[in-house]
Interface confidence: low
């Protein structure tokens, strides 16, 4: 007869491991007992049950309840046994050594290897701005055993490095992601992808890029000069910028106070009816906690009567 | 000291591919990328790629994407780089340097591509 | 692509003399705190010799009469007082994004 094995069992940390150990022999023959034992090169046999025909499983004391016999049915030849809740530290060799009858001894090893999926953790780098060279903008670590992959999924183009480092029964990886950091990138989801042979699907976690800009400001509203007259209702200015954080406002007049009347809405400048008064240089001045940006325009309110007057003067000079 | 131990010339014909070794010494070799740089005869540098011998990621030179692959083998500490459907234009000499500052160049394979 | 523009292709020194080598970038390769260009030398037949690093920075081993300066988009490089042994070409390069990207070499002659 023989004995039937594997050469390496797997299992996730936690699981059940089923520790097989099957003599295949010619009719009439008996398994009297199967002994069970830990023998890592250099620790010598540590004992973990005896499985006997007659007497039923003794299991040693270092291994007191968490070895057992398979669920029923069960075949009088089959020596496997289960070893509950597999930790880390019961990583290695296994022999199961069957005693027959009448063909004598037989012995066979395998190897336990325990699974440690990785918890992955994805830390954001410094805060991004653009105009920046290339920088970190997320580095990603997962610690398993076997060492993980540690990938990264996005649109966004950048360049990673890693670097592992090796504990006694597991390894630590890190990834970092660097980018140059630019206003488009702005919203865009980084993710960190952590394959491990412990994990049904891969582990993801996103980071949602933030990139800190403030674009050139600029004023609407003169781009037609004749629209601003005495007297018309309704004129406004308009600041016109973006940024992230998204920028705030402030309106000023460069040559005195704003004038009476005029109010200041956020990015918008409403006039009252215009008169004189409102002619002048005003600045839109934006900014958030990256920049700060200025824009100014001159307003020159017409007055009807003079522009006339000018006509005429024209007219009666040719 | 470290070293990038490149092979010698190598000849080869339009279409075919070339394989080039570069052995590193003196290092911990999964600490640096390996990149690779191109110099024609009388002519500029080129940087064709790099990858992470930690974990096999590449990143790579557009112009070089796709006939150009980047491999490493941890356990000889070798980097390798295979270009594939050579022409004439590949003549040149192929520079493996260790990454993150390129202090340390190997010392060039000569790739002559020619009927 | 970055494309950096050396200048001028050659130049020829007298021993003793300075040697002044210009690389300008088709955009900035600066932040306020680095700048990352970098320059190499290169004899016949010999791969490139890393001189100085983030611009201004002297790597070890190499002689002090080599600086280099510059920031944004326009970089150079000194030699000062010039010797035969500094007969080469030389390049910059720089390492702002993908892919780096190198000058097209400038020849120094000692006469």
């Known amino acids: 007869g023989e004995l039937e094995t594997s050469d390496v069992v797997t299992v996730v940390l936690g699981q059940d491991a089923k520790l097989p150990c099957f003599y295949r022999g010619d009719s009439g023959e008996q398994v009297g007992q199967v002994a069970w034992a830990r023998v890592d090169a250099g620790e010598g046999a540590q004992e973990l049950a005896l499985l006997h025909s007659k007497y039923g499983l003794h299991v040693s004391p270092a291994y007191e309840g968490r070895v057992e016999q398979p669920p029923p049915p069960r075949n009088p030849l089959d020596g496997s046994v289960l070893l509950r809740n597999a930790v880390q530290a019961d990583e290695g060799e296994y022999e199961c050594r069957v005693s027959t009858f009448p063909a004598g001894s037989f012995q066979a090893r395998l190897r336990l290897r325990v699974l440690v999926p990785p918890l992955p953790s994805l830390n954001p780098g410094p805060a991004l701005e653009e105009g920046q060279g290339l920088t970190l903008a997320a580095s990603c670590t997962a610690e398993g055993s076997p060492a993980p992959s540690v990938t990264w999924d996005t649109e966004v183009k950048g360049t990673t490095s890693s670097r592992s480092f090796k504990h006694s029964r597991s390894a630590a990886v890190t990834s970092e992601f660097h980018l140059v950091p630019s206003r488009s990138m702005n919203g865009q989801p980084l993710t960190c992808v952590v394959s491990h042979p412990g994990l049904l699907q891969d582990q993801r976690i996103t980071h949602i890029l933030h990139v800190s800009f403030l674009a050139e400001a600029s004023v609407r509203g003169l781009e037609d000069q004749n629209l601003w007259h005495i007297g018309r209702e309704g004129a406004m200015l308009k600041c016109l910028s973006e940024g992230q954080p998204p920028p705030s406002y402030n309106w000023t007049r460069l040559d005195g106070p704003l004038p009476s009347g005029v109010r200041v809405d956020g990015d918008t400048l409403g006039f009252p009816p215009l008169t004189t008064e409102h002619s002048g240089i005003y600045v839109c001045h934006v900014s958030n906690e990256f920049s700060s940006r200025d824009s100014q325009v001159t307003v020159d309110v017409l007055d009807p009567q003079e522009d006339s007057g000018k006509q005429v003067d024209l007219v009666s000079a040719s | 000291e470290v070293l990038l131990q490149q092979s010698g010339p190598e000849l080869v014909k339009p279409g075919a591919s070339v394989k080039i070794p570069c052995k590193a010494s003196g290092y911990t070799f999964t600490d640096y990328t390996m990149d690779w740089v191109k110099q024609s005869h009388g002519k500029s540098l080129e940087w064709i790629g790099d990858?992470?011998?930690?974990?096999?990621?590449?990143m790579y030179n557009e112009k070089f994407k796709g006939r150009a692959t980047l491999t490493v083998d941890k356990s000889s500490s070798t980097a390798y780089m295979e270009v594939r459907s050579l022409t004439s234009e590949d003549t040149a000499v192929y520079y493996c340097?260790?990454?993150?500052?390129?202090?340390?160049w190997g010392q060039g394979t000569l790739v002559t591509v020619s009927a | 692509d970055i494309v950096l523009t050396q200048s001028p292709a050659s130049l020829i020194v007298s021993l003793g003399q300075r040697a002044t080598i210009s690389c300008r970038a088709s955009q900035s390769v600066s932040t306020s705190s680095n700048s990352y260009m970098h320059w190499y030398q290169q004899k016949p037949g010999q791969p490139p010799k890393l001189l100085i690093r983030f611009a201004s920075n002297l790597e070890s081993g190499v002689p002090a009469r080599f600086s280099g300066s510059g920031s944004g988009t326009y970089f150079t490089l000194n030699i000062h007082p010039v010797e035969e042994e500094d007969s080469a070409t030389y390049y910059c390069q720089h390492s702002w994004e993908i892919p780096y990207t190198f000058g097209g070499g400038t020849k120094l002659e000692i006469k």
């Open positions: 340097v260790r990454g993150r500052g390129f202090a340390y």
């Open positions: 990858i992470n011998p930690n974990n096999d990621v590449t």
